[in-house]
């Protein structure tokens, strides 16, 4: 079942999925000047059986002979400033992602794909939050959010994370990180804001495959 809303927006933080639950869809978006091949699916779909999950359909982009008429949402100038680029040091290398049953790994890039990936998550998906560079995490609980369904409506749980302006960047789950005890801290209003926007992730994998560079855009 598709999550019909989006993971919460945490100020000075970005999120990512370590693996994608079966049923997750990824838009086949092409970069400017290219379009999806006519016979191509508009989505890649994480599917699987009891033993193996993989992405169905392969996105393919071809040069736009005629003027590209694909609908693109252009961020307004005030939205542009919400883009944040962060280097995320991660012990988890793309090549060594642990295979979770019923989950797909990050799909490999395809030729002439757009710089941003648009995922459609499903109920049961977990995403993990990390403070952007220059901010440190204060944890009150898990820095993660799970899409749940109640009474036919989907919602994401609120990650217990506050990012405070300090120099050391925090790490993704599974990595060493100093713990704070922020019990007395009030939750900021911004950390409570649930965005209703698709979360687009731009990834560039360094040659060493040890660094994720994310651009997150709230469109």
């Amino acid at each position: 079942e598709l999550c019909d809303d989006d993971p919460p927006k945490i100020t000075h933080a970005t999120f990512k999925a370590v693996a994608y639950k079966e049923g997750t869809m990824l838009n086949c978006e092409c970069k400017r000047g290219f379009r999806r091949i006519k016979s191509g699916s508009p989505y890649m779909l994480c599917t699987g059986n009891s033993s193996h999950s993989s992405w169905d359909n392969q996105c393919q982009c071809t040069s736009s002979a005629a003027r590209n008429t694909t609908k693109q949402v252009t961020p307004q100038p005030e939205e542009q400033k919400e883009r944040k680029t962060t280097e995320m040091q991660s012990q988890m290398q793309l090549a060594d992602q642990v295979s979770l049953p019923g989950h797909c790994r990050e799909p490999p890039p395809w030729e002439n794909e757009a710089t941003e990936r648009i995922y459609h998550f499903v109920v049961g998906q977990t995403v993990y939050y990390q403070c952007v560079q220059g901010y440190r995490a204060l944890h009150r609980g898990p820095a993660e959010s799970v899409c749940k369904m109640t009474h036919g409506k989907t919602r994401w749980t609120q990650p217990q994370l506050i990012c405070t302006g300090e120099t050391e960047p925090s790490q993704f789950p599974g990595e060493e990180e100093p713990q704070a005890s922020p019990d007395g801290l009030p939750e900021s209003e911004t950390s409570r804001l649930v965005t209703t926007t698709d979360f687009r992730i731009q990834t560039e994998v360094a040659a060493t495959m040890e660094t994720f560079i994310f651009t997150t855009e709230y469109q």
């Epitope: 079942e1 598709l2 019909d4 809303d5 989006d6 049923g23 869809m25 508009p42 989505y43 779909l45 609908k71 949402v73 961020p75 939205e79 459609h120 499903v122 109920v123 369904m149 009474h151 036919g152 409506k153 989907t154 919602r155 649930v194 965005t195 209703t196 926007t197 698709d198 709230y218 469109q219």
Partner: antibody, heavy 116, light 106 residues
């Protein structure tokens, strides 16, 4: 209480465009996606697409991506769907429906008739 | 796209009858949702997540099924139940509906 109120019936010429509105009240407009569903005369329901009102992100059924353009105005809590290059087969009732999961609230529908 | 096939397309029944409508999905889905529509009116949510009754829906309605086969049952048909019923999946885009089952007076 939650209400979705749509604009009135329209009669349009082939080749023209029409813009249907859906004014939401009784809930936080930006917290839910707004979906659009079409029903041709005597036919079933077809999902056309949705908009996320807070930023204007849209997702379309490929069948309608060149026909429909969905927009929203946060200041008036109104979603819109514009249909272009109208043809007789676009004659239908168009519904807006609140998302966030199942469609628990629907507009009353807007009949668009395309006739020369 | 996931195709949804309802059967029957039309069902003639009398008040008090037990009525069963089936919906088959072309691929396995997580849940089925059901809507009721009366002439000239917008659809109304009837059953969500396969078997949960929407607010205000009488207990004579029930839903069941899993995978690709789902069923809507009305245990004892009432005058207010003559309408068209649609199944709906939102497990994958594009979201799709069944073609509808019209329950009419026999």
């Amino acid at each position: 209480q939650v209400q979705l109120v749509q604009s009135g019936a329209e009669v349009k010429k082939p080749g023209s465009s029409v813009k249907v509105s859906c004014k939401a009240s009784g809930y936080t407009f930006t917290s839910y996606r707004m979906h659009w569903v079409r029903q041709a005369p005597g036919q079933g329901l077809e999902w056309m697409g949705y908009i996320k009102p807070s930023r204007g992100y849209t997702e379309y059924n490929q069948k309608f991506k060149d026909k429909a353009t969905i927009t929203a105005d946060e200041s008036t809590n109104t979603a819109y769907m514009e249909l272009s290059s109208l043809r007789s087969e676009d004659t239908a009732v168009y519904y807006c429906a609140r998302g966030g999961g199942v469609f628990d609230y629907w507009g009353q529908g807007t009949l668009v008739t395309v006739s020369s | 796209d996931i195709q949804m096939t309802q059967s029957p397309s039309t069902l003639s029944a009398s008040v008090g009858d037990r009525v069963t409508i089936t919906c088959s999905a072309s691929s396995s889905i997580s849940y089925m949702h059901w809507y009721q529509q009366k002439p000239g009116k917008a659809p109304k949510l009837l059953i969500y997540t396969t078997s949960e009754l929407a607010s205000g829906v009488p207990a004579r309605f029930s839903g069941s099924g899993s995978g690709t086969e789902f069923t809507l049952t009305i245990s004892s048909l009432q005058p207010d139940d003559f309408a068209t019923y649609y199944c709906h999946q939102r497990s994958t885009y594009p979201l799709t509906f069944g073609q509808g089952t019209k329950v009419e007076v026999k």
